[in-house]
């Protein structure tokens, strides 16, 4: 875990400014677990950051990100009806100035750090139709979603909607 | 103009069926989830059924599992709500209601039909 | 399960008065909430969501706040089409649920 006092003082004042001139509709301070309730935690190793899926033991803190919620319109799709829908994406920051980015080409998820405008390999497209869990599909690459393989965070290619009840792509937040 | 349009309510006995039906246009329907909502006479809201854009996700109130079953047909942008077993504290409008965001349950329910009486009575 | 508490039940006022509803959530959540205005005989209709986004076509005296467990409806300055009942939403959990409601009537 990252041991920063920083990261529980974690405000909405560090994300207060615009990203790509859209402002955040909410943000949110939660801790990150998978579907079988291991955590997600970050830690810094020879000057980055590395992510980690474990089970904490009794007392341990969990780790906490700041979830920042945009609102994003995409285009119809080819039915003709003309109307677009509206959808929710998400950037994930356990600490600041860092965020979580899809590497596409080496399936995995990582920790960068970066200035605004964030890039789009930054923001997850959010799915929370599985009950109370939700999933982070890559803005970069559709039907890819952060996912969970050899205890570490993965990007994961779904095949098919039915497939988004899949455990390892599942993540439950939680504000304790 | 987006719209949805309820039909399938009337007089059933208790212990009777009903299906309701809902046709919606003027939005890509399988992109959205979509809801049951109910509202007994003089009473307030009550929210009933959801059911995932694609059909593989369904959640229900406590008070109707097992006695009421939520579908959808994508291809004739139809939602239906099959009610059976039905009790006397059923009767209510019932209202469908299309999610605010596709892929997501969090923004509430931006877009309603005008409701459909269902009666539960001997 | 959580439950939204609403209140006043109800409150009476005149045109021009500033109105303020609360709701309270029985367990802390996100901004996941949505606020509702209900003419009788007519369905809901969406005003507020995440708290505090105006639905497109929502006059600008409705403002919604808060986050965790306390929100906040606000109507600036009432007009005679908002006298009405007021829901608020939780979209955050299921099941999803609804506050009791709060009837807006005329003084």
């Known amino acids: 875990a990252f041991g920063i006092s920083g990261v529980q003082k974690y405000t909405r004042a560090l994300h207060d400014s615009s990203i790509t001139g859209i402002s955040p509709i909410t943000e949110y301070l939660a801790s990150l677990s998978t579907y079988n309730d291991q955590s997600i935690t970050f830690a810094l190793e020879d000057e980055s950051y590395e992510i980690y899926v474990e089970d904490l033991k009794k007392d341990e803190k969990k780790d906490k990100v700041l979830l920042s919620y945009y609102e994003s319109q995409h285009p119809s799709n080819e039915s003709g009806d003309g109307v677009d829908g509206k959808m929710l994406m998400v950037t994930l920051s356990p600490t600041k100035d860092f965020w979580l980015h899809a590497n596409n080409k080496e399936h995995s998820v990582e920790l960068h750090k970066c200035e605004k405008p964030l890039p789009d390999q930054a923001f997850f497209v959010l799915h929370n139709m599985h009950s109370n869990c939700v999933s982070f599909e890559c803005k970069t690459d559709p039907g890819v979603f952060i996912g969970v393989k050899d205890n570490h965070l993965a990007l994961i290619k779904v095949d098919s909607s039915e497939n988004l009840c899949t455990e390892n792509i599942l993540f439950k937040l939680s504000e304790t | 103009e987006v719209q949805l349009v309820e039909s399938g309510g009337g007089l059933v006995q208790p212990g009777g069926s009903l299906r309701l039906s809902c046709s919606a246009s003027?939005?890509?329907?399988?992109?959205?989830?979509m809801n049951w909502v109910r509202q007994a006479p003089g009473k307030g809201l009550e929210w009933v059924t959801a059911?995932?854009?694609?059909?593989?996700?369904?959640y229900y109130a406590d008070s109707v599992k097992g006695r009421f079953t939520i579908s959808r047909d994508n291809s004739k942008n139809s939602l239906f709500l099959q009610l059976n077993s039905l009790r006397a504290e059923d009767t209510a409008v019932y209202y469908c209601?299309?999610?605010?965001?596709?892929?997501?349950?969090?923004?509430?329910?931006?877009?309603w039909g005008q409701g459909t009486m269902v009666t539960v009575s001997s | 399960d959580i439950q939204m508490t609403q209140s006043p039940s109800s409150v009476s006022a005149s045109v021009g008065d500033r109105v303020t509803i609360t709701c309270r959530a029985s367990q802390g959540f996100s901004s996941w909430l949505a606020w509702y205005q209900q003419i009788p005989g007519k369905a809901p209709k969406l005003l507020i969501y995440?708290?505090?986004r105006l639905q497109s076509g929502v006059p600008s005296r409705f403002r919604g706040s808060g986050s965790g467990t306390d929100f906040t409806l606000t109507i600036s300055s009432l007009q005679p089409e908002d006298f009405a009942t007021y829901y608020c939403?939780?979209?955050?959990?299921?099941?999803?649920?609804f506050g009791g409601g709060t009837k807006v009537e005329i003084k």
């Open positions: 209601a299309k999610q605010t965001y596709t892929s997501s349950w969090y923004g509430g329910f931006d877009i």
């Open positions: 995440a708290a505090s």
């Open positions: 003027g939005f890509t329907f399988s992109s959205y989830a």
């Open positions: 939403q939780q979209a955050n959990s299921f099941p999803l649920t």
């Open positions: 059911i995932s854009g694609s059909g593989g996700g369904t």
